[in-house]
């Protein structure tokens, strides 16, 4: 039994620096309990950027001083990263860990680059 | 750097009781699954428990289920497995190591602390 | 439980030889959650490779893992004399996570 994450390839983040994705989990069991982890790899450094545990049919709860916020849905969670910079262009890889009942699974996405672009300076106008 | 370091094995009958100590420095606890790992004389490897991250779920190999427990004290940075019931063949070098960022590898261990169960 | 089996038992070779370690899973390791450990006799083991084919920090680019589903490979391209250990395969895709026997590498 093993468990597949799938997760969109590439997202853009808007104007103001908020990206959103689904991470999708086929659960090979019945999980009440699921870890979601969102980790980015940009030249071959991981850095956790946020991680929320729910109980299924609950809400994810993330950390207050997170960047990520989220919703859960079935075996579907939809996550949003905001406060982004270009500086934070890279591959933002879905972890999921079925943490109860035993026994755990885990899956891992292939991640979904997120491209980041600083909006322009408005220019000065004369009107 | 990461540290781990055990204590608190020894020689002990059948049927008492033993609690072993992990140490962590360098990173905190909470941020990672936290192993227990045996090693019998002359023996192979056999994972043993885990307590993953915030500390509620607790997952133990068949061989110990209802025996060992797991715990850990954040203050301190500190981990531990409380072994009841002792059995002969828990006789062990026991490891505690750090799960991996992609899952549970084992990154960095301790040195071990050695078990004997001996009338 | 997934129960792994490592072959061969004991490699006899010699220091520049090449070294290949089999690891064979009795079910598929979803997504290739295999690692590979060195061990010395006295020593903790030190992990080599994770995810099937990544090396650790700080590892060698002699060592290199291969495959996917039930069947791995830890390859050693030239034996270097600090290389005669034990090597362990083990799968972290579900609980129990489960160790092979173990393969020795010895010098012949």
């Known amino acids: 039994k093993a468990m597949h994450v799938a997760q969109p390839a590439v997202v853009l983040a808007s104007s103001r620096g908020i990206a959103s994705f689904v991470c999708e989990y086929a659960s090979p069991g019945k999980a009440t309990e699921v870890r979601v982890t969102v980790l980015r790899q940009a030249d071959s450094q991981v850095t956790e950027v946020c991680a929320a545990t729910y109980m299924m049919g609950n809400e994810l709860t993330f950390l207050d001083d997170s960047i990520c916020t989220g919703t859960s849905s079935g075996n579907q969670v939809n996550l949003t990263i905001q406060g982004l910079r270009a500086m934070d262009t890279g591959l933002y890889i879905c972890k999921v860990e079925l943490m109860y009942p035993p026994p755990y699974y885990l899956g891992i996405g292939n991640g979904t680059q997120i491209y980041v672009i600083d909006p322009e300076p408005c220019p000065d106008s004369d009107f | 750097q990461v540290q781990l370091v055990e204590s608190g094995g020894g020689v002990v009958q059948p049927g008492r009781s033993l609690r072993l100590s992990c140490a962590a420095s360098?990173?905190?606890?909470?941020?990672?699954?936290m192993h227990w790992v045996r090693q019998a004389p002359g023996k192979g490897l056999e994972w043993v428990a885990v307590?993953?991250?915030?500390?509620?779920?607790?997952h133990y190999a068949d061989s110990v289920e209802g025996r060992f427990t797991l715990s850990r004290d954040n203050s301190k940075n500190t981990l531990y497995l409380q072994m009841n019931s002792l059995r002969a063949e828990d006789t062990a070098v026991y490891y505690c190591?750090?799960?991996?960022?992609?899952?549970?590898?084992?990154?960095?261990w301790g040195q071990g602390t050695l078990v004997t169960v001996s009338s | 439980e997934i129960v792994l089996t490592q072959s061969p038992g004991t490699l006899s070779l010699s220091p520049g030889e090449r070294a290949t370690l089999s690891c064979r899973a009795s079910?598929?390791?979803?997504?290739?959650?295999l690692a590979w450990y060195q061990q010395k006799p006295g020593q903790a083991p030190r992990l080599l490779i994770y995810?099937?084919?990544s090396r650790a920090t700080g590892i060698p680019d002699r060592f290199s893992g291969s495959g996917s589903g039930t069947d791995f490979t830890l390859t050693i391209s030239r034996l270097e004399p600090e290389d005669f250990a034990v090597y362990y395969c083990?799968?972290?895709?579900?609980?129990?996570?489960?160790f092979g026997p173990g393969t020795k590498v010895d010098i012949k």
């Open positions: 190591a750090r799960g991996g960022v992609w899952g549970s590898y084992f990154d960095y």
């Open positions: 360098g990173f905190t606890l909470s941020n990672y699954g």
């Open positions: 307590i993953w991250y915030d500390g509620r779920n607790k």
């Open positions: 079910q598929s390791v979803s997504s290739s959650y």
């Open positions: 995810g099937a084919s």
């Open positions: 083990q799968q972290y895709g579900t609980s129990p996570f489960t």
